[in-house]
Structure formats: C-alpha cells, structure tokens
Amino acid sequence: SGVFQLQLQEFINERGVLASGRPCEPGCRTFFRVCLKHFQAVVSPGPCTFGTVSTPVLGTNSFAVRDDSSGGGRNPLQLPFNFTWPGTFSLIIEAWHAPGDDLRPEALPPDALISKIAIQGSLAVGQNWLLDEQTSTLTRLRYSYRVICSDNYYGDNCSRLCKKRNDHFGHYVCQPDGNLSCLPGWTGEYCQQPICLSGCHEQNGYCSKPAECLCRPGWQGRLCNECIPHNGCRHGTCSTPWQCTCDEGWGGLFCDQDLNYCTHHSPCKNGATCSNSGQRSYTCTCRPGYTGVDCELELSECDSNPCRNGGSCKDQEDGYHCLCPPGYYGLHCEHSTLSCADSPCFNGGSCRERNQGANYACECPPNFTGSNCEKKVDRCTSNPCANGGQCLNRGPSRMCRCRPGFTGTYCELHVSDCARNPCAHGGTCHDLENGLMCTCPAGFSGRRCEVRTSIDACASSPCFNRATCYTDLSTDTFVCNCPYGFVGSRCEFPVGLPPSFPW
C-alpha cells in the first residue's frame, strides 16, 4: 500500500488556447485530470487501473501551482494504491478548460481539452522527487512525482506491513525496510521480551518490564540469587530454596532446637553445673541447699514432710530435726512407744499387736482411715454420679440425687421421655437429648399435638354445578348443598338424567 504523489509546479499556456487552437473566452480556466495506470508501451486513455484524481481550477492560462500540502490542500496530488507497487507505471495528465464551476465531463465544452501528456516508465519507491517537463506547440507543464509507502508500509514495493507499537504485543518501531527495531529495554522477534536488570539471575529471576528483576518462588535479593530458607528456619541457612541447614549448635526441622543450650542460655542458677542432654534440653546439678529445674530454689529440708506420726520438723544448718509427739521416737518419729493397751485406734478401729507388742496397727471401720483411724473418708471425692447427678454423703454410704430424665444408682440410666406417651391425637414421640419432640398428624399442632387445626375441606372446590360447600369440623370432611336440579355427593348428576351404569 502506498501513494503516487504528483506535484504540479507550473503550467504555461501563453496564447490561452485549447488543444484545437481555439481561444478560451475570456481565458482558459484550467483544471487537471490525472490518470495513473499500469505500464503500457503505448499509453492509451483506457481505464485508470492505479487511480484517478482531479483538481479544482488552479489558474487561468499560465500560472504557477503552489505547494499546498502543509495546508491540507491538493498539491501534491495523491493517488493511493493498495497493492504491491510494481515499479513501472503509465501517467496521463490532462489540462482542461472549465468555463463554469461544473467540472463534470458532460458539463464541459466538447473541445475543452487544453493539453494532454502521457508518460510511462520505471519508478522505484523513494522520498526523492523526479522532476519532468512536457512541452507542446502551445503549452508547457512542469511537474514532479514520486512513490512513497503509506503509513505502516515499508520495503522496495511497499508490501511489508509494520505498525510501530508499545504495548503487550510488542515494543518496537519500524526500520525503512520494514524490519522491527526494538525499543530500548526490549528484545525478541516481536520485541515482547523485556531485558531484565543487569545481573538478574537467568533461571531464578524474570521481569515483566525492562530493568526489573522479579524473583521466582524460593529466591530473593536484588538479583534473585539468594535462596529463601524453609519458612520458620531460625538458626539455619539454604543453598537451594526451602532448605534449612542448621548452624552449629542447633538442630531440628527449623534449626530452632538448641543443641548447646548451656552455652547459649546459661540456665543453671546458684553455681549449679549445666549439662546438655539433647535438643533444647539440659540438666542442672545443684549445689547443696538448692533445688528446682534450674537450681533456682533454696532447699528447705522440711519441705518434704519427713517427720511421721505428727512429728514437727525443724530446719537446721546441716539438715533437719524431727520433734516427735509423745509415744513416738526415731529420726522421723517412725517408731511408736504405744501399744494396743494404750487404745490408740479411734472411731472404733481394731488394734493389732506387731513385733511382739513393740508395735501395733489399726484396722479402721468403713468411712475412716489413717494410721489411727483418725481421718473420715469422703465417699464423694471421686464424683461417682453421672449426668450431672449430685453426690450426698449418707453416713456409711453415699447416694446420687439425679437430674430430671436420669435414674440408676449413679444416674447412669436415661429415662425415656416418650415412655408416658405425651403426644396427643396420635402424635409420634421422638426422644431428644434435652427432652422430646412430637410430630403431629394432619389437623393438629402444638408442642404435644394438643391444638386442633381445622382443615378447610372446601378449599379444593369439590362441589359441581355451583353447589355450596360446607366443612364438617368434627370429621374434616365437606358437604355439598346442591342447587335445584342436581343431586349426588358433589351435585354432579342432573335430576332426571341418572348416571349411565355399565349394566
């Protein structure tokens, strides 16, 4: 696709005559017709296969034609073509006389031709104008012409389409031969590929616009050459994404388990000795007088209640001392000076001699315990009642007071709420965790199906022949009151026309 441009420069018709030699009156008001066509060895006026164009009246007799291209005018004349320029052409330029304003051929005088020129030859596409001058006995025409490609067409014959663009489909301008020339920062056959930031890692980085470096998953850094360790990796590094290679002294999946806790945290207090004992674990060996995981507690040796049989403990510099109650002795008051003769067993406990009377043991009745049966047993401490039942101590035994819906010694049995048939009018009962639910038959509603819901049996218009319908609320049925001339439960039979029976 291109344009043949013809620039008319000067026309000389000094005598102001037509081609026939007849003078124009008052002068030759001259306009031009241009016919561009395929190459002909002998140019004939036939069809203008490449196009035709006419000018307005440009002057009278002799005149120069001003270049009017900048003002959007008609010089140079434009003859566009939408095919591959063949490199050869024929051109006919006619000068005509128009006495009036109507330039149509049929409106011209029959001898309106002033001059005609016909040229043919080769013409390559290019910016340079070819200057030519044609002279006859009566006239002279000076003009120049060239062929240029239309916008977006390039090449020797304007056959290469190239439209500069700067969008998703490409970022380029067009070279004179129609090849693409990528805009700065773009590459590829159609200049669709951005050139990433210099140094951006070839595999791990990419970009959607020039001088950018976007990292693929697992990579980071300005040039996407640093791997991202496993999410949550605390004291570790990576050589490929999502790794967590632990630093020295750390372990575990996330390198967050301290294998050298003693050094990193010094957890043992009060001069205790620390020993690493695995991932994030350690053992403190306390100095005398200290206790606790980290030996943080000063040790009171009475804290372990070492004194038996009601002996009282006294802390001492080098340990403790038990003050025994009457009848007891020993380091921990563990030896009794009492015997069964002293009746040491309370609450009806039975005394049994031991070690040839040097010792005794009490056998306690139910509900009592202790070495002297001095403690009462609380039978409710083990919460024996199920389903929220309340435990009550009743002398030697206990009992459970159950919540509604439960029964049994320990309220372990669920009482069926449906057992007493609570749903009225044939409703179906369903046991639920927190009660019951009734599904009511048609015509009843309410929590226990106790409410009668009347059904309008007339709603379906069962009566024929404009009979009046009544609902029987006791049976939920309908009654049809027939108009004169009709009988039947639905007033469907006319009187005198009994139904036709098959017999």
């Epitope: 049929e106 029959p110 031709l113």
Partner: antibody, heavy 119, light 106 residues
C-alpha cells in the same frame, strides 16, 4: 430511449431558405452542446455548426458563415438550423448530433433529413 | 485550415486485423474520435478520446494516437465491419472530420 429526430428538409431553389428542426428525447437536452453535420451524396462528413448548452456560444464552419444560423429552444428540447441563401453545394443529408462534453465527440446522431437545392 | 488525412480505402480478409490511419500535425496533442457509417445509415461513435470505446462497441475496436498519427484498429475483422470510417478532431474554427476510409472485407 435516447433519440434525435430531424425534420424540415426538402427541395428548395438556389437562394432560398429552409428551417431544419431536431427534436431530442431520452436525455437532458439543456445540459449538452448540440451540432449539425452534413453529408453530400457520395461524400464524407462535414461539420456545419455547434451551439453550447445554453445557446450563449455558437460556432460554424467557414463555408456556411453568414448564411446558416444554429439556435435552440431548451423548453421544447429542440435544435434548429436556419438555412438562408442556399446554394447547390449545400445539397446534403443534414444530421443533428449530440456533442459529448470534454472531447468525447458526437455520441448520438439523428437519422438525417435531406436538403436538395436546385438551380 | 486543419486537415485530417485518411486513406480512401483499406481492404482486409475476414479474421485479419485492419488498421485505418488519420494524420495531421501534432495530432497526438489532441483527442481523436472515430465514427463508423454503413450505407444508408447515420454515423455511430466507435472510439473517443483516442482509445475509449463507448458501451456496446465490440472489444475488437481499439485506438491509439501519438505524434502526428491516430490509428483505428479492428482485430478479427468481420464482414459486418465493412463500412466507411471517419476520424474527427478539433481546430480553432471548430470540428474537423477526416475524408473517410472505405473498409472492404474481402
């Protein structure tokens, strides 16, 4: 149908007069130049006169100048040729022809009317 | 006065090409028309503006004009093409016809 029909021809004595008419139909008569062309028996075509579409411009051959007058009535779609001072050499078939604008030539011709000048 | 010169007669065999010339000084600067006239009939325009055929004229009729000579060419001449042919141009006085050429199809 585009048509030109001449009339008014006949036998006339030398020095006499005739008025030829040409009735046009099938085209816009008032928009076209019209002409008269004659052909003597056994001879070639000879142009006689031509008139512009509005009658403002008239041209005639040197051989008939001052004797023949071309005119037109656009309201009647009719072309005329007034022949005065007729001579024997004016004997010919007179054709009425429509002239195409812009050097197209004469694209419509009538059937002709015979003018015979006797001495 | 301007004169258009034609040969009085041209003969051609059927199917052959006939060429009729029309000469005058610098005729190529003008547009030439050609007319066919058969005996007893009015002339008919067959070529105008050197080489253009009016509608209805067969393609075997063509024309050219350059220098001092215009040419009417009838290719594949048929018996029905036998007629008188006239060229026509303009001079300062008005319309000019050539003397005519009788085409005979043998």
């Amino acid at each position: 149908e585009v048509q030109l029909v001449e009339s008014g021809g006949g036998l006339v004595k030398s020095g006499g007069s005739l008025r030829l008419s040409c009735a046009a139909s099938g085209f816009t008569f008032r928009s076209h130049w019209m002409s008269w062309v004659r052909q003597a028996p056994g001879k070639g075509l000879e142009w006689v006169a031509i008139i512009s579409y509005d009658g403002s411009n008239k041209y005639s051959a040197d051989s008939v100048k001052g004797r023949f007058t071309i005119s037109r009535d656009n309201s009647k779609n009719t072309l005329y040729l007034q022949l005065n001072s007729l001579r024997a050499e004016d004997t010919a078939v007179y054709y009425c022809a429509k002239a195409g604008g812009g050097n197209v030539g004469f694209d419509i011709w009538g059937q002709g009317t015979m003018v015979t000048v006797s001495s | 006065s301007y004169e258009l010169t034609q040969p009085p007669s041209v003969s051609v065999s059927p199917g052959q090409t006939a060429s009729i010339t029309c000469s005058a000084d610098e005729l190529g600067t003008q547009y030439v028309s050609w007319y066919q006239q058969k005996p007893g009939q009015s002339p008919v325009l067959v070529i105008y503006q050197d080489a253009t055929r009016p509608s209805g004229i067969p393609e075997r009729f063509s024309g050219s004009n350059s220098g001092n000579t215009a040419t009417l060419t009838i290719s594949g001449t048929q018996a029905m093409d036998e007629a008188d042919y006239y060229c026509q141009a303009w001079d300062r006085s008005g319309v000019v016809f050539g003397g005519g050429t009788k085409l005979t199809v043998l």
